[in-house]
């Protein structure tokens, strides 16, 4: 009795859904009473399916309402674990153990990343030095480095601060600032680079606005 996996590594985005599956041999009709399916992650029990019933009492609380065994897939010889709203804590090595006449188990790794997609930006002017301060802030995982460039393909020196945005989500809060003497309409780019997944790089475009001129009759002295 041997079980197989089509993938032993799943890489998914934070907040998305994932279905990991282990395949086992089924000849014609599936005998549910003879089937045992366990899904575990490290020391956490996720699924305990015995004699056609799922025992939710043993399920670790972190998977409550989020993890389920897709019962209809069992008849196709697939023990499919679906996890919804994936968190960073869900990353790790999963083990599917199946008993059906014989017994076998396989390991599957789940990696979770959170792209720095939503970049907040701000442009301000230092009234003393007339320097512009450009700021880009975003949340993601794992940590990202931020590079600043201009439209002439030059890399500029910004200052980046990384903190944990929320102890619950474990996402990183990355804030980068660039102080520069510049003029209206110049374009700058802040790019959040994730070495682990280059396709997850995100960029914001910052255009220096025209200076805000206060009409002479509205100026305060």
């Amino acid at each position: 009795f041997t079980i197989t996996v089509s993938k032993d590594l799943y890489v998914v985005e934070y907040g998305s859904n994932v279905t990991m599956e282990c395949r086992f041999p089924v000849e014609e009709q599936l005998d549910l009473v003879s089937l045992i399916v366990y899904w575990e992650m490290e020391d956490k029990k996720i699924i305990q399916f015995v004699q056609g019933k799922e025992d939710l009492k043993v399920q670790h609380r972190s998977y409550s309402q989020r993890a389920q065994l897709l019962k209809d897939q069992l008849f196709l010889g697939k023990a499919a674990l679906q996890i919804t709203n994936v968190t960073l804590e869900d990353a790790g090595v999963y083990c599917c153990l199946i008993g059906y006449g014989g017994a076998d188990y396989k390991r599957i790794t789940l990696k979770v990343h959170a792209p720095y997609r939503k970049i907040n930006q701000r442009i301000s002017v230092d009234p003393v030095t007339s320097e512009h301060e450009l700021m880009c802030q975003a949340e993601g995982y794992p940590t990202a480095e931020v590079i600043w460039t201009n439209s002439a393909h030059q890399v500029l020196n910004g200052k980046t601060i990384i903190s944990v945005s929320n102890m619950e989500t474990k996402l990183f809060n990355v804030t980068s600032t660039l102080r520069i003497n510049t003029t209206a309409n110049e374009i700058f780019y802040c790019t959040f680079l994730q070495r682990s997944s280059p396709e997850g790089n995100s960029t914001a475009e910052l255009v220096i606005p025209e200076p805000f001129l206060v009409p002479a009759n509205e100026r305060t002295h």
Epitope: E145, I147, T149, N150, S151, A152, H153, Q154, T182, T183, A184, N185, E186, I187, Y189, C190, T191, L193, R195, P198, N201, T203, E205, I208
Partner: antibody, heavy 121, light 111 residues
């Protein structure tokens, strides 16, 4: 149609000056960094100068620094290269080239047909 | 300055066959998770035309017969299959650091 048309080339004596122009059309000129690239008679390509979209930042290789000045007029959609203290090794076909738009798109994606500069006594 | 050495200086390939052009950089052109190597095609009497950027990305409108590969210091432009219209000189160019430099070119001819 995206188009770059260079003009202003010609024959000039060593030590002389010349100003090249490049007329851009078919794209939002003021959003792009621009460059000049030259091709020597031996067909070697050399980057000459770059300028940011707003004209604030300019960059040059050491071979032309202090002698060449790149500038632009976004209202007229024109790019310029002022060349002075010209040397025989500046003889080349000068191309106006658009820089790739966005972060990390570091390439020349549109080229003009070029204008020839000959430095000879 | 980063020196780019292209090889061969010229090559003749039969129609329908594969052409491989190499470009070696005197130092790495990799940074920020990218390889900043570009490839251009120049036909006689015409300006250079961008084919491949960041080592392996095909420029819009360029046929899939053209492909690029490599990282750090060693890069390759492959044309497969070669067509009559591909007769040109091909240049590699690094944009990882100033001054931006070009290779000496490889002239492709049909056998």
């Amino acid at each position: 149609e995206v188009k770059l048309v260079e003009s202003g080339g010609g024959l000039v004596k060593p030590g002389g000056s010349l100003k090249l122009s490049c007329a851009a059309s078919g794209f939002t000129f003021s959003s792009y960094g621009m460059s000049w690239v030259r091709q020597t008679p031996e067909k070697r390509l050399e980057w000459v100068a770059s300028i940011s979209n707003g004209g604030t930042y300019t960059y040059y290789p050491d071979s032309v620094k202090g002698r060449f000045t790149i500038s632009r007029d976004n209202a007229k959609n024109n790019l310029y290269l002022q060349m002075s203290s010209l040397r025989s090794e500046d003889t080349a076909l000068y191309y106006c080239a658009r820089l790739g738009y966005g972060s990390l798109n570091w390439y020349f994606d549109v080229w003009g047909a070029g204008t020839t500069v000959t430095v000879s006594s | 300055d980063i020196v780019l050495t292209q090889s061969p200086a010229s090559l003749a390939v039969s129609l329908g066959q594969r052409a491989t052009i190499s470009c070696r950089a005197s130092e790495s052109v990799d940074s920020y998770g990218n390889s900043f190597m570009n490839w251009y095609q120049q036909k006689p009497g015409q300006p250079p035309k961008l084919l491949i950027y960041r080592a392996s990305n095909l420029e819009s409108g360029i046929p899939a017969r053209f492909s690029g590969s490599g990282s750090r210091t060693d890069f390759t432009l492959t044309i497969n299959p070669v067509e009559a219209d591909d007769v040109a000189t091909y240049y590699c160019q690094q944009s990882n650091e100033d001054p931006r430099t070009f290779g000496g070119g490889t002239k492709l001819e049909i056998k």
